[in-house]
Amino acid sequence: GITIPRNPGCPNSEDKNFPRTVMVNLNIHNRNTNTNPKRSSDYYNRSTSPWNLHRNEDPERYPSVIWEAKCRHLGCINADGNVDYHMNSVPIQQEILVLRREPPHCPNSFRLEKILVSVGCTCVTPIVHHVA
Amino acid sequence: GITIPRNPGCPNSEDKNFPRTVMVNLNIHNRNTNTNPKRSSDYYNRSTSPWNLHRNEDPERYPSVIWEAKCRHLGCINADGNVDYHMNSVPIQQEILVLRREPPHCPNSFRLEKILVSVGCTCVTPIVHHVA
């Protein structure tokens, strides 16, 4: 791993829970500089493996709302606009970090949690399984 | 919004920075019980809009390593295995939360940061055949 020289201006870490419990500033800094994150918002409809977006809400989680993609078809849309079952629509999944209130209902105490979300769908060539 | 009844066992929040600064337990709880995140690991190669995965490392960020998708082609792979430029390979992007060390190099003090990552690629019908 990379060793980081410690900044002498760091907050005190003599807590008995350190290093498991850290201080986090919730004022979000947005690093998305050159592109518009809303730009790709129509891909779910224009893709050859289109998807629907479902709202997943949980007030005990931060962010409380996460959108989950569900592929519309088993196959993919061909040039004629029909579903081609020789190809497969599959979800692209990503593990993301969220904050879970812990203990529950506490406004200022959280635990990191890793969840798997489906972000969108892509069209893949199927793996053919021949029955042995 | 949803009002959450406060748990009387919550940590003390009489900090002058509250509610902007919260305590976070970094012992990650993994909610990915039912599915194998590695399951979709070959989609990048089998997709009609294939992508490569590039390692993005930043020791000042948590998680320090994020894998970013980079579409291989401008067009999409057709049934003959050739690139069809009448279709567009595009990245599926997602805004995710990460923790940024703040002040820099501090092991126990972070700020939430929102970054846009490319998770994979999908094949879309173009709105225009050339950049409009």
């Epitope: 500089t33 050159n34 592109t35 518009n36 730009r39 790709s40 | 992508w51 490569n52 590039h54 993005n56 970013e68 998708a69 980079k70 579409c71 291989r72 082609h73 401008l74 067009g75 690139v83 430029y85 567009n88 390979s89 595009v90 990245p91 990552v117 490319s118 879309v124 173009p126 709105i127 055949h129 050339h130 950049v131 409009a132």
Partner: nanobody
């Protein structure tokens, strides 16, 4: 912050050739395509050519097809535009830029551009 520096323009006679270069730095890890664009006096900026960083596959505007060739050098993070059989209507300021959505990129997706490089074709 993305930085784009174009070079290689100038004045050339119709039928002549020029080679433009573009050095790009600060690109996103996920950057997968680069493009050349141009803006003639009194006209809107238009797409000229695009290239995939990974495959090297290219796409050209109909007006430059078979005359212009785009290439890239991944190690140097540079792209090039070889322009042959130049015509007076190719006169414009030429720009390069990252294409964050490949061929789906639109002009209004961009927040900033480089300075561009003047190409003048005299008859």
């Amino acid at each position: 912050q993305v930085q784009l520096v174009e070079s290689g323009g100038g004045l050339v006679q119709a039928g002549g050739s020029l080679r433009l270069s573009c050095a790009a730095s600060g690109l996103a890890v996920s950057s997968y395509a680069m493009g050349w664009f141009r803006q003639a006096p009194g006209k809107e900026r238009e797409f000229v050519a695009a290239i995939s960083w990974i495959s090297g596959g290219t796409k050209y505007a109909d007006s430059v097809k078979d005359r212009f060739t785009m290439s890239r050098d991944n190690a140097k993070k540079q792209v090039y535009l070889e322009m042959n059989s130049l015509k007076p209507e190719d006169t414009a300021v030429y720009y390069c830029n990252d294409m964050p959505y490949g061929l789906d990129t639109r002009m209004d997706d961009y927040k900033y551009w480089g300075q561009g490089i003047q190409v003048t074709v005299s008859s």
